[in-house]
């Protein structure tokens, strides 16, 4: 039950983080205009990873897309990649982790080939994670870079009198968006992994030996469990220290290493 | 056509309260903001404030502590209201309608004179 | 507050000349997330509200001879009158859009001989 529990909540907190990494990736505030120590302004910017728009106070906003891939800075397309790799990512995780789910049944799949496919998902989750928080954490340095350096010379007088303020930006709404998501997606991954492990089969599952005793035929069927005596106790190789209960992970299934106490 | 029509008092004595309505026609009145701008006589413009279309509102900071800027979605109706007025707040008062993606105030009332005297 | 100066304070021309009148801001009018200028020019003739002439610093509103330019980029900005008629009479201002208070200039008079 709690490995079915930890896949089924991985794979919910996987699908909430993609979701959102796919909605920061598409938000136009991943920078916003600095009002901080600036004049009173009736002319809001704000840019994204597409786009730059233009909010202005009568609420009419102006949105102009990036028409050019060359002339783009490289640490904006290296996020736009890292972004995209984590969605692509994601999304195929998705799509595996759904077959790999323990309480969706297709066919006669093999508990061992849901625990690949949950591990393979779960890894999936955690590469889409990292590369949305690094992409994220890229904007966010780039971000923090320029704002020093749009700092150090915010003001150029012109003859004592003119002021030109260069426009700063700081975080949007779009980096703590990523950065949340990534991390969920990150756990969902996680706990994919873990839940992988509580799918696997025993590795050393034997097949009975008979042994012929003189006098008496007697099969020898060991459980494979230390509690077990091996002598025709615990035949179907199910846990002895249940007190008779059956849980759902137990019906139909191998037991698993990882299933002593 | 749109229109904006201002209507005041005309005089107003000292240390009175000041109150305008701008009723506007021949357009949205939920999709504009709406400006006030004054002229004392022989003087340039002042501006007043503004309510945007969703009803917030600026104020020029000097005049903030005694203007108030409202309005009446129903009867497409703005209203400035000016306290403690002074002789100096003489002047013709403009409501002008928000150019909205265009730069400046693109349509403006005919003004009405407030004229501060006892 | 942003000032707007405008100089000159008057001028008078003969009808069919050429007349430039100039507008200086004390910051830079000029947005850079869309690279708009934040100034627009009115024309005020006697006994009349203003009228908006440009905005955008070059735009002209709909319905005004061709004959008026707007001109110039973030601080330093131009009105320009190609061949001035004589119904041109009026006080022109420049006013910032960007900033708040939004602040007029004090005017140029155009005085036709």
């Known amino acids: 039950m709690a490995v079915t529990a930890c896949q089924g909540l991985g794979f919910v907190v996987s699908l909430i983080g993609i979701a959102g990494i796919i909605a920061a990736t598409c938000m136009d505030q991943w920078s916003t205009q600095d009002l901080y120590n600036n004049p009173v302004t009736a002319v809001f910017n704000y840019q994204g990873l597409w786009r730059s728009c233009v909010r202005e106070s009568s609420g009419f906003t102006e949105c102009r897309g990036y028409f050019t891939l060359l002339g783009l800075p490289a640490m904006l397309q290296a996020v736009r990649a890292l972004m995209i790799v984590g969605i692509v990512l994601g999304a195929i995780g998705l799509l595996v982790s759904i077959f790999a789910l323990k309480c969706i049944r297709i066919g006669s799949m093999e508990d061992s080939a849901k625990a690949n496919m949950t591990l393979t998902s779960g890894i999936m989750f955690i590469v889409s994670g990292l590369c949305a928080i690094a992409g994220v954490s890229v904007f966010a340095n780039m971000l923090v870079t320029n704002f020093w350096m749009s700092t150090a010379n915010m003001y150029t007088g012109m003859g004592g009198m003119v002021q030109t303020v260069q426009t700063r930006y700081t975080f949007g709404a779009a980096l703590f968006v990523g950065w949340v998501a990534g991390g969920l997606t990150l756990i969902g991954g996680v706990m994919m992994c873990i839940a992988c492990r509580g799918l696997a089969p025993e590795e050393t599952n034997y097949k009975a030996v008979s042994y012929h005793a003189s006098g008496h035929s007697v099969a020898y069927k060991p459980g494979g469990f230390k509690a077990s005596t091996g002598f025709g106790s615990n035949t179907k190789n199910k846990k002895i220290y249940d007190g008779g209960a059956r849980t759902e992970d137990e019906v139909q299934s191998y037991p698993s290493k990882h299933d002593y106490v | 056509q749109v229109q904006l029509k201002e209507s005041g008092p005309g005089l107003v004595a000292p240390s009175q309260s000041l109150s305008i309505t701008c009723t506007v026609s021949?357009?949205?009145?939920?999709?504009?903001?709406v400006h006030w701008v004054r002229q004392p006589p022989g003087k340039g413009l002042e501006w007043l404030g503004v309510i945007w279309a969703g009803g917030s509102t600026d104020y020029n900071a000097a005049l903030m502590s005694r203007l108030s800027i409202r309005k009446d979605n129903s009867k497409s109706q703005v209203f400035l209201k000016m306290n403690s007025l002074q002789i100096a707040d003489t002047a013709m008062y403009y409501c002008a309608r928000d150019g909205h993606g265009k730069v400046g105030f693109d349509v403006w009332g005919a003004g009405t004179t407030v004229t501060v005297s006892s | 507050d942003i000032v707007m100066t405008q100089s000159p304070s008057s001028l008078s021309v003969s009808a069919g000349e050429k007349v430039t009148m100039n507008c200086k801001s004390s910051?830079?009018?000029?947005?850079?997330?869309?690279?708009?200028?934040?100034l627009a020019w009115y024309q005020q003739k006697p006994g009349q509200p203003p009228k908006l002439l440009i905005y955008g610093a070059s735009t002209r509103e709909s319905g005004v001879p061709d004959r008026f330019t707007g001109g110039g980029s973030g601080t330093d900005f131009t009105l320009t009158i190609s061949s001035v008629q004589a119904e041109d009479l009026a006080i022109y201002y420049c006013q910032n859009d960007h900033f708040y208070p939004f602040t007029f200039g004090s005017g140029t008079k155009l005085e036709i001989k």
């Open positions: 910051q830079s009018l000029l947005n850079s997330g869309n690279q708009k200028n934040y």
């Open positions: 021949g357009f949205s009145f939920t999709s504009y903001g």
